[in-house]
C-alpha cells in the first residue's frame, strides 16, 4: 500500500479468482483513543471499533472511503483505491490501446516544433468519475523539469454502439534549446483514477521523434501563361521553429483528381514553390516534414485547381 | 519567412553538398544495422544514447544560429575553444564564431572516423561476418573533412590486443551510429544556415 496523495491510498493486488488479497491496517487520525467506530462509503453499518481497523482487501467491494467517527462526529477519512496486477502485468482497463505506432500504445504525443512544447492525448470509453494527473520530466534519474497543465476532455466521438472520449494535455520543457541534441528522453506519466480503480501509464520519447509540423500556410496558385501548368507557392507554418534556414522543411506536392482512384502526381521539393499541371476538378495539396530528421509529415494543406 | 533563394556561396556550397551526403550515408548505414542486427538492442528506444564528443567538442553551442543566442537555455555550456582557419567559407566571411563552429565539426568527424575505423577492424575479424561499415560512409566523412580543410594532428587508430567481444562491438556500433546520425543532422542544419547567411 502507498499514499497517492493526502488520505488517498493505493492497494496493489494480484488479481485472479479467489486471490487472498492484502491485509491493510487503517489508523484513525485523531488523538482520541476510545469510542471510535468505522464505516465504509455511505453505509451506516459499523465495520469495527478502535483507533485501528484491520481489513482484508480482495476486491473493489473492500475499497472505498473508510471513515472513523466518535459520537456522531467524523474524525478522519482514508480513501482506498485498487491497482490490479493480472498475470504479473498492471491492468490497463481505463485507457484504450491506440495500437499506433505499435500495440500497447495508450499515450500518444506530438510536437509542432523544437521549442520543448508538446501535446499528449489518450482515449477511453469511460464517461464519468474519471480523473487524470500528468507528470513529466527529461530523464528519470536526476530528472529535469517539464511542466504539464491539467488534462482536459478534448473530443467526443461515436464508435459503433459506444462513445469514445479523447483527453489531452500540454507540456513544456522548462529550459529547452531548440538546437539541442537530445540524449535523455522525455518521460510522461499519467495517473488515471476511475471510481476506485487506479492505473498508471507512461510514455518515453525524444522531441525529435514526435515532431509533426503544422501544414504549410498561404497555399496559392499562379497560372502560367499559355500553359496548363501552375506555379504553386506556400510558406512555412507560423508554429515551425526559426530560423528556417537552420530548421529547414521539405515538402510534398500532390495533384489529386476528384476520384480517389485517379493516379496521384507527387513532387518533392525543398523550395517553397513548385510547378505542376493542374487537371480539371483536381486539387493541389502540400505537406511538410523536417528536412533532415524524418519524423511525421504534416497534415495536407489543399486548394482546388479551378 | 521563406528560405532565402540566394545563390549559394561557392566556398560554402561543397560543404553543404558533402553534409547532405553524410546524412544520407549515415541514415542508410543505421537502417542497415537495424535490419541486420534485428536481434540486438539497436533501436533508438533500446540503446543508451552516448555522445563520444561530449566535453571534447562543442558543435551545438559553437554553431548556434545567431537568432538562438538570445535563448538562455542554448547558452548553458557555450565554449570557445577552437580557433582555426577553415576553407569552407570565403575568407572574407569567416568570422571568429564560424571558424569555431567549422573547426568543431571537423573535430567531430575526426573522432567518429577513428571510432568507426577501429570498429570496422574488429568487425572484419568476426567469423559470422555479419556486418561491416559502409565504405561509402567512411569516404563521405573523409570528403567533408577535406572540404573543411582544417589542419589538425592525426589521431592514431586505436588498436586492441585482446580478443574482441563481437556482441559488445555490434551494440557499440548501434550506439555510435545513432549518435552520429544526430550529429549529422546538426551538421546539415548548420551548413544550410551558413549557406543561407
Amino acid at each position: 500500500i502507498w499514499e497517492l496523495k493526502k488520505d488517498v491510498y493505493v492497494v496493489e493486488l494480484d488479481w485472479y479468482p479467489d486471490a487472498p488479497g492484502e491485509m491493510v491496517v487503517l489508523t484513525c487520525d485523531t488523538p482520541e483513543e476510545d469510542g471510535i467506530t468505522w464505516t465504509l462509503d455511505q453505509s451506516s453499518e459499523v465495520l469495527g471499533s478502535g483507533k485501528t481497523l484491520t481489513i482484508q482487501v480482495k476486491e473493489f467491494g473492500d475499497a472505498g472511503q473508510y471513515t472513523c467517527h466518535k459520537g456522531g462526529e467524523v474524525l478522519s477519512h482514508s480513501l482506498l483505491l485498487l491497482h490490479k496486477k493480472e498475470d504479473g502485468i498492471w491492468s490497463t482497463d481505463i485507457l484504450k490501446d491506440q495500437k499506433e505506432p505499435k500495440n500497447k500504445t495508450f499515450l500518444r504525443c506530438e510536437a509542432k516544433n523544437y521549442s520543448g512544447r508538446f501535446t499528449c492525448w489518450w482515449l477511453t470509453t469511460i464517461s464519468t468519475d474519471l480523473t487524470f494527473s500528468v507528470k513529466s520530466s527529461r530523464g528519470s534519474s536526476d530528472p529535469q523539469g517539464v511542466t504539464c497543465g491539467a488534462a482536459t476532455l478534448s473530443a467526443e466521438r461515436v464508435r459503433g454502439d459506444n462513445k469514445e472520449y479523447e483527453y489531452s494535455v500540454e507540456c513544456q520543457e522548462d529550459s529547452a534549446c531548440p538546437a539541442a541534441e537530445e540524449s535523455l528522453p522525455i518521460e510522461v506519466m499519467v495517473d488515471a483514477v476511475h471510481k476506485l480503480k487506479y492505473e498508471n501509464y507512461t510514455s518515453s520519447f525524444f522531441i525529435r521523434d514526435i515532431i509533426k509540423p503544422d501544414p504549410p500556410k498561404n497555399l496559392q496558385l499562379k497560372p502560367l501563361k499559355n500553359s496548363r501548368q501552375v506555379e504553386v507557392s506556400w510558406e512555412y507554418p507560423d508554429t515551425w521553429s526559426t530560423p528556417h534556414s537552420y530548421f529547414s522543411l521539405t515538402f510534398c506536392v500532390q495533384v489529386q483528381g476528384k476520384s480517389k482512384r485517379e493516379k496521384k502526381d507527387r513532387v518533392f521539393t525543398d523550395k517553397t514553390s513548385a510547378t505542376v499541371i493542374c487537371r480539371k476538378n483536381a486539387s493541389i495539396s502540400v505537406r511538410a516534414q523536417d528536412r533532415y530528421y524524418s519524423s511525421s509529415w504534416s497534415e495536407w494543406a489543399s486548394v482546388p485547381c479551378s | 519567412r521563406n528560405l532565402p533563394v540566394a545563390t549559394p556561396d561557392p566556398g560554402m556550397f561543397p560543404c553543404l553538398h558533402h553534409s547532405q551526403n553524410l546524412l544520407r550515408a549515415v541514415s542508410n548505414m543505421l537502417q542497415k544495422a537495424r535490419q541486420t542486427l534485428e536481434f540486438y538492442p539497436c533501436t533508438s528506444e533500446e540503446i543508451d544514447h552516448e555522445d563520444i564528443t561530449k566535453d571534447k567538442t562543442s558543435t551545438v553551442e559553437a554553431c548556434l544560429p545567431l537568432e538562438l543566442t538570445k535563448n538562455e537555455s542554448c547558452l548553458n555550456s557555450r565554449e570557445t575553444s577552437f580557433i582555426t582557419n577553415g576553407s569552407c567559407l570565403a575568407s572574407r566571411k569567416t568570422s571568429f564564431m564560424m571558424a569555431l563552429c567549422l573547426s568543431s565539426i571537423y573535430e567531430d568527424l575526426k573522432m567518429y572516423q577513428v571510432e568507426f575505423k577501429t570498429m570496422n577492424a574488429k568487425l572484419l575479424m568476426d567469423p559470422k561476418r555479419q556486418i561491416f561499415l559502409d565504405q561509402n560512409m567512411l569516404a563521405v566523412i573523409d570528403e567533408l573533412m577535406q572540404a573543411l580543410n582544417f589542419n589538425s594532428e592525426t589521431v592514431p587508430q586505436k588498436s586492441s590486443l585482446e580478443e574482441p567481444d563481437f556482441y559488445k562491438t555490434k551494440i557499440k556500433l548501434c550506439i555510435l551510429l545513432h549518435a552520429f546520425r544526430i550529429r549529422a543532422v546538426t551538421i546539415d542544419r548548420v551548413m544550410s544556415y551558413l549557406n543561407a547567411s
Epitope: 479468482p17 455511505q42 453505509s43 473493489f60 467491494g61 470509453t125 469511460i126 459506444n162 476511475h194 480503480k197 | -
Partner: nanobody, 124 residues
C-alpha cells in the same frame, strides 16, 4: 439512449426458483460490469450479486451466496440472476445496474446505469 430492462419477476412460494433477466441496449456493455440490487419496502437499496465484464469474476451478498447465480451473455447484452431456494426475506424490487470499466462494485453509488426494477414476492 441507454436502457436496462428487467424481466422475470413474480409471486412465488418459499423454496421455489425464479430467473431474472436484464436486457441492455443503447451502448455496448461488453466492457462494463453488471450487478443486481434489491430494495425491500422501507429499506435501502442493497447489493445482491455482480459480475465483471468477462464473466470470470462474480460477487454475492452473504445472504444469497450458494442460492443465487449471476451470469451474462456478452453477445446479446444480457445479464441473468438465477434465484433458487427463495425465502420471504428475498422479497423486494430487483434492479439491474451497469458500471463502466470492467470491474464490479458492491456500493450502489458506483453504478452508472439503472433499470426500472422488477417485483419479486416470496410468500411463506
Amino acid at each position: 439512449e441507454v436502457q436496462l430492462v428487467e424481466s422475470g419477476g413474480g409471486l412465488v412460494q418459499a423454496g421455489d426458483s425464479l430467473r431474472l433477466s436484464c436486457a441492455a441496449s443503447g451502448r455496448s456493455f461488453s466492457n462494463d460490469a453488471m450487478g443486481w440490487f434489491r430494495q425491500a419496502p422501507g429499506k435501502e437499496r442493497s447489493f445482491v450479486a455482480a459480475i465483471n465484464w468477462s464473466g470470470e469474476l462474480t460477487g454475492y451478498a452473504g445472504s444469497v451466496k450458494g442460492r443465487f447465480t449471476i451470469s451474462r451473455d456478452g453477445v446479446e447484452n444480457m445479464v441473468f440472476l438465477q434465484m433458487n431456494s427463495l425465502v420471504p426475506e428475498d422479497t423486494g424490487v430487483y434492479y439491474c445496474a451497469a458500471v463502466e470499466g470492467r470491474d464490479y462494485y458492491r456500493g450502489a453509488q458506483y453504478y452508472d446505469y439503472w433499470g426500472q426494477g422488477t417485483q419479486v414476492t416470496v410468500s411463506s
